[in-house]
Amino acid sequence: FNMDTRKPRVIPGSRTAFFGYTVQQHDISGNKWLVVGAPLETNGYQKTGDVYKCPVIHGNCTKLNLGRVTLSNVSERKDNMRLGLSLATNPKDNSFLACSPLWSHECGSSYYTTGMCSRVNSNFRFSKTVAPALQRCQTYMDIVIVLDGSNSIYPWVEVQHFLINILKKFYIGPGQIQVGVVQYGEDVVHEFHLNDYRSVKDVVEAASHIEQRGGTETRTAFGIEFARSEAFQKGGRKGAKKVMIVITDGESHDSPDLEKVIQQSERDNVTRYAVAVLGYYNRRGINPETFLNEIKYIASDPDDKHFFNVTDEAALKDIVDALGDRIFSLEGTNKNETSFGLEMSQTGFSSHVVEDGVLLGAVGAYDWNGAVLKETSAGKVIPLRESYLKEFPEELKNHGAYLGYTVTSVVSSRQGRVYVAGAPRFNHTGKVILFTMHNNRSLTIHQAMRGQQIGSYFGSEITSVDIDGDGVTDVLLVGAPMYFNEGRERGKVYVYELRQNLFVYNGTLKDSHSYQNARFGSSIASVRDLNQDSYNDVVVGAPLEDNHAGAIYIFHGFRGSILKTPKQRITASELATGLQYFGCSIHGQLDLNEDGLIDLAVGALGNAVILWSRPVVQINASLHFEPS
């Protein structure tokens, strides 16, 4: 209708990075920018994704290098994390959130794809990491190895081999295992502290240089107490599981201290593994019963999990695997390992700013049934799996509903702010729920809408529209972009209008009647009034139209509803040659060129496009006859 198609600003970017996958208009004290997501962007050797800021009138885009943002205390994997897959602007302070839903971190032998987002302040500076699904690894352990280095240990090289082999089994790194070693005999010394080395390679290297210090006495109690009171303090981390491995070949010369030492270790929640090396006893034909009883006393209960004995120093290699497995069985404590909570949640797949924080879609949560998490300044709200059961029953739990594929919110005069989330794979047809979240990790689900067609991906895109700008939502639009009709993936957008407290189905938006795939409804944007009739409008993307060139449809708002016939269809081919997937993202909230009119930003594969609004001239005709 009044969007200019002759002089668009086409901002080029990398196609391979999918520059243009997301677009947001941005205002910094009067300066207008486009924020563009490129979720496949490369940073160094890693395909992290990134976000660009692009000047609106002329000039080149600048990469924000958010892909370089690093989380401390985790062994992170940023490759393929898809930074920029979702963007959410906070109009209150002009900050925005850029999410990397496939950001993952190493936990033991697994990579957990919890996802994370970066909050960027209004002047494009990174300010904070938002990662509500990030949990401590079960391998978040401080392990102190307490080595008997007294004279009777022989040959020392076997102890060294054992030490190196067990260290190689440990998942050493930020947010995972730290290892310290103390050696004792008559005295106790730190061979290295918990925080001296941050990789298996470095720890193994240090361990290979540990020499036997000797001593005529074996003060095991003192060694354990030294480890508890000193080794766990120097470089120890708050909240880390404390694990002690004691390796000794004889009765201690300070066994009367063991009771108090073990009591203190228990009080400090130190899990103790104890290894009795029987070489000295076997070489001399001595009964080891008293020694074995002492080592069992040192080991945490139950003995069968924490106590080991070997015939001699050379046999230490035989227990490496068993000891490693026992230590890491601590990981699975009281945990059903066959099911995932938030470990694969992909938080930030979608995002939406609300008054007190941000909603994040987590499609992979709870075995890919999905969830919506909320991060606020006061903390995070992570609804329990059970809170979704009313609309996502147990019997469908293996279907992977992908709740959180998209998130938004509506405002009703009765209930205030209500959150909305889509689950496009629910029972194959898709579902949308309207809900409120509670701090006790429960939800109240107020309403649910279901898709009609299998595979239509109903709920993969949702937009709420306040047509008249009174602060109350009038219309909820739900996209089903894979809706199959007339032999093609045509797509459909469902219209729901607010009546009292419920959204009531009121037809669908009309697309053009072409015989190609279109995916109409892949993106739906509520935009501010484009045609200056004081009603806010809607733009719908169909990125596969015209043989994947793409198109957008503009629908005008009118008296608390939306006109279902488009007022303007803009195809990529009208704007520039070579555009593809035009309409994959849309944003229209700002006047970008200071002409008093709201302009549109539209994403395409490797491009961001700005469409300028033209003024609408209202001509009121009146006939005046003279003489009357």
């Epitope: 008559e186 006495e217 003060r219 109690a221 003192f222 107490e225 009765e251 201690s252 010369h253 300070d254 066994s255 009367p256 201290d257 063991l258 009771e259 108090k260 073990i262 008293t290 009883n293 002492e294 006393y297």
Partner: antibody, heavy 120, light 109 residues
Framework: EVQLVESGGGLVQPGGSLRLSCAAS????????IHWVRQAPGKGLEWVAS????????YYADSVKGRFTISADTSKNTAYLQMNSLRAEDTAVYYC?????????????WGQGTLVTVSS | DIQMTQSPSSLSASVGDRVTITCRAS??????VAWYQQKPGKAPKLLIY???SLYSGVPSRFSGSRSGTDFTLTISSLQPEDFATYYC???????????FGQGTKVEIK
């Protein structure tokens, strides 16, 4: 030659204090435990307290807990028993004895004893 | 706490007699039981440690044994210098709490 010599005993009024010393020679206090054992006139042996000179861990009999304090000064190779709030029933000969790994946790050397009399 | 009940509290015997003194622990204990001999006005002397090991310098007529929670000191052939009071002592495992029996006085018949 291993020797333990107690000193510091004497007559004290009820409620009073006394400090006994146990000077060790012929071995290093650092690598052993010292126990105090008492014997009231005509009675059997009663264990009082012990200390690990190395770790400073202490144990006490219930009858003296909170009143007696055992300590050791490894530089002087001497152990002490500080006795406060003394009662008539604390009257006894007090022995110190060595306790260590090499005697399989038995009291292998004893001092000659020092008499403590609590009386008004 | 573990109690050590020693019996008899006294016995009369003649030179050359075989004498047996028993200590019963109130609960299962380790073998860290020792036996001492004390003569009037003197400090106790260690005879047996670890329930059955003879301390150096102690005549071989002294022996110790264990059966469950019962610990026994045996003097195979009583000598004149053996008339004294005998005490058993138990060490609590992994602490330095110790307990003495009440004593057995061996007198000349």
């Amino acid at each position: 030659e291993v020797q333990l010599v107690e000193s510091g005993g004497g007559l004290v009024q009820p409620g009073g204090s006394l400090r006994l010393s146990c000077a060790a020679s012929g071995f290093n206090l650092y690598s052993s435990y010292i126990h105090w054992v008492r014997q009231a006139p005509g009675k059997g042996l009663e264990w009082v307290a012990s200390i690990s000179s190395y770790s400073s861990y202490t144990y006490y009999a219930d009858s003296v807990k909170g009143r007696f304090t055992i300590s050791a000064d490894t530089s002087k190779n001497t152990a002490y028993l500080q006795m406060n709030s003394l009662r008539a029933e604390d009257t006894a000969v007090y022995y110190c004895a060595r306790y260590w790994y090499y005697s399989a946790w038995a009291l292998d050397y004893w001092g000659q004893g020092t008499l403590v009399t609590v009386s008004s | 706490d573990i109690q050590m009940t020693q019996s008899p509290s006294s016995l009369s015997a003649s030179v050359g007699d075989r004498v047996t003194i028993t200590c019963r622990a109130s609960q299962s204990v380790s073998s860290a039981v020792a036996w001492y001999q004390q003569k009037p006005g003197k400090a106790p002397k260690l005879l047996i440690y670890s329930a059955s090991s003879l301390y150096s310098g102690v005549p071989s007529r002294f022996s110790g044994s264990r059966s469950g929670t019962d610990f026994t000191l045996t003097i195979s052939s009583l000598q004149p210098e053996d008339f004294a009071t005998y005490y058993c002592q138990q060490s609590a495992p992994y602490s330095s709490l110790i307990t003495f029996g009440q004593g057995t006085k061996v007198e000349i018949k």
